[in-house]
């Protein structure tokens, strides 16, 4: 698989880590979370093109058979691969809580 | 998350896990690949609308974003939840070996 | 090691029913396709039936098509066939066998379970 | 359906000297890549064990005197030397395709 810069599509166009500034309005989250106030949210963005940080062997697949039958097997998708974790200060019933999520910011991206 | 058969878009066009027939030489594997000749290639295919099987926090944010920036945040895309094993009967540099691939055959689908 | 032990032997009437019974051990048996292969008393051995790791494959002889079920419960990692409408003809020794995948070979027979049809 | 014909019938060969089994199928059981032929041993009173898979390659354990080769419709099992241990009958067996069907068998005796 080509490493990550190595987009044939062009610096920046295939699947990679990108950073979207949210407010607690934007994520729904106003009348629960106190804290932060604003996220830095990691995702995964970007195009799979054949092979590109194929996650496994079904990501290979997947890129073989969406050559052959483009209009019924999509290509490979840009996901995590991994997350890191996030501390959000709750509102709760009695005051306030400390809740820390494993699986909101994406660490680093494949395809499949 | 809604369940799997509760799609708001049509019934069957939401992520779910469809089988493409496919053979060695559809998938590249014709020259070091000895059986099976064709793979019954299970994949999740289908749209991710607003929660539908949403995996976790992060693809709850996806879909909130996407919502509000459609242009920059992609919606969540159906991809594998796990994975059922394949054997495989390779050809070796010493003859014929029985390989086990755990991560070749989707075995159920979430969105991400 | 592997081991196939087949279980269900019998004397049946023309058309009667049986079920064949193969308890495997030693393997990973939901990751393989699995297979019934019988041996005539003349001694060719006849393919029967296959059923693919899932048990969503399933392919038959036309000499039993219709007849025969093979199924698996790979919780219990046992191989099933259910055999109806028994005729003489279907008088043989039937061996479990590991089939591995379509295409393949059978690596592991079982030690055979012997089925006789006679009035 | 492809049908495998095995000769001879049966066989009988010289300890030490070569055995030759031919197995005939009626329609082709190879690809552009491989040849789904494979070769099993049967002794009195045991279930057949496997020999030589996709016509050429050894099952494990299999001593090397054991070879097979050909591909299309043609395929041959070789023993040389033979053993007194090899008396037994085979059987070629095709995968190209379901169903899968096996030759009637070539009973080897030595001698």
């Known amino acids: 698989a080509r490493n990550g810069d190595d987009c044939p599509l062009g610096p920046g166009r295939c699947c990679r880590l990108h950073t979207v500034r949210a407010s607690l309005e934007d994520l729904g989250w106003a009348d629960w979370v106190l804290s932060p106030r604003e996220v830095q949210v990691t995702m995964c963005i970007g195009a799979c093109p054949s092979q590109f940080r194929a996650a496994n062997m079904h990501a290979q697949i997947k890129t073989s058979l969406h050559r052959l039958k483009p209009d019924t097997v999509p290509a490979p998708c840009c996901v995590p691969a991994s997350y890191n974790p996030m501390v959000l200060i709750q509102k709760t019933d009695t005051g306030v809580s400390l809740q820390t999520y494993d699986d909101l910011l994406a660490k680093d991206c494949h395809c499949i | 998350a809604r369940n799997g058969d509760d799609c708001p878009l049509g019934p069957g066009r939401c992520c779910r896990l469809h089988t493409v027939r496919a053979s060695l030489e559809d998938l590249g594997w014709a020259d070091w690949v000895l059986s099976p000749r064709e793979v019954q290639v299970t994949m999740c295919i289908g749209a991710c609308p607003s929660q539908f099987r949403a995996a976790n926090m992060h693809a709850q944010i996806k879909t909130s974003l996407h919502r509000l920036k459609p242009d920059t945040v992609p919606a969540p895309c159906c991809v594998p939840a796990s994975y059922n094993p394949m054997v495989l009967i390779q050809k070796t540099d010493t003859g014929v070996s029985l390989q086990t691939y755990d991560d070749l055959l989707a075995k159920d689908c979430h969105c991400i | 090691d592997v081991k196939l032990v087949e279980s269900g032997e019998g004397l049946v009437k023309p058309g009667g029913s049986l079920k064949l019974s193969c308890a495997a051990s030693g393997f990973t048996f939901s990751s393989y396709a699995m297979s019934w292969v019988r041996q005539t008393p003349e001694k060719r051995l006849e393919w029967v039936a296959y059923i693919s790791s899932g048990g969503d494959n399933i392919y038959y002889a036309d000499t039993v098509k219709g007849r025969f079920t093979i199924s698996r419960d790979n919780a219990r990692n046992t191989l099933y066939l259910q055999m109806s409408s028994l005729k003489s003809e279907d008088t043989a020794m039937y061996y479990c066998t590991r089939a591995l995948v379509e295409n393949a070979y059978f690596d592991y027979w079982g030690q055979g379970t012997t089925l006789t049809v006679s009035s | 359906d492809s049908v495998l014909t095995q000769s001879p019938a049966s066989l009988l060969v010289s300890l030490g000297q070569r055995a030759t089994i031919s197995c005939r199928a009626s329609k082709s059981v190879s690809t552009s890549t491989y040849s789904y032929m494979h070769w099993y041993q049967q002794k009195p009173g045991q279930p057949p064990k496997l020999l030589i898979k996709?016509?050429?390659y050894l099952e494990s354990g299999v001593p090397a005197r054991f070879s097979g080769s050909g591909s299309g419709t043609d395929f041959t099992l070789n023993i040389h030397p033979v053993e007194e241990e090899d008396a037994a009958t085979y059987y070629c067996?095709?995968?190209?395709?379901?169903?899968?069907?096996f030759g009637g068998g070539t009973k080897l005796e030595i001698k």
């Open positions: 067996q095709h995968s190209r395709e379901f169903p899968w069907t």
């Open positions: 996709y016509a050429s």
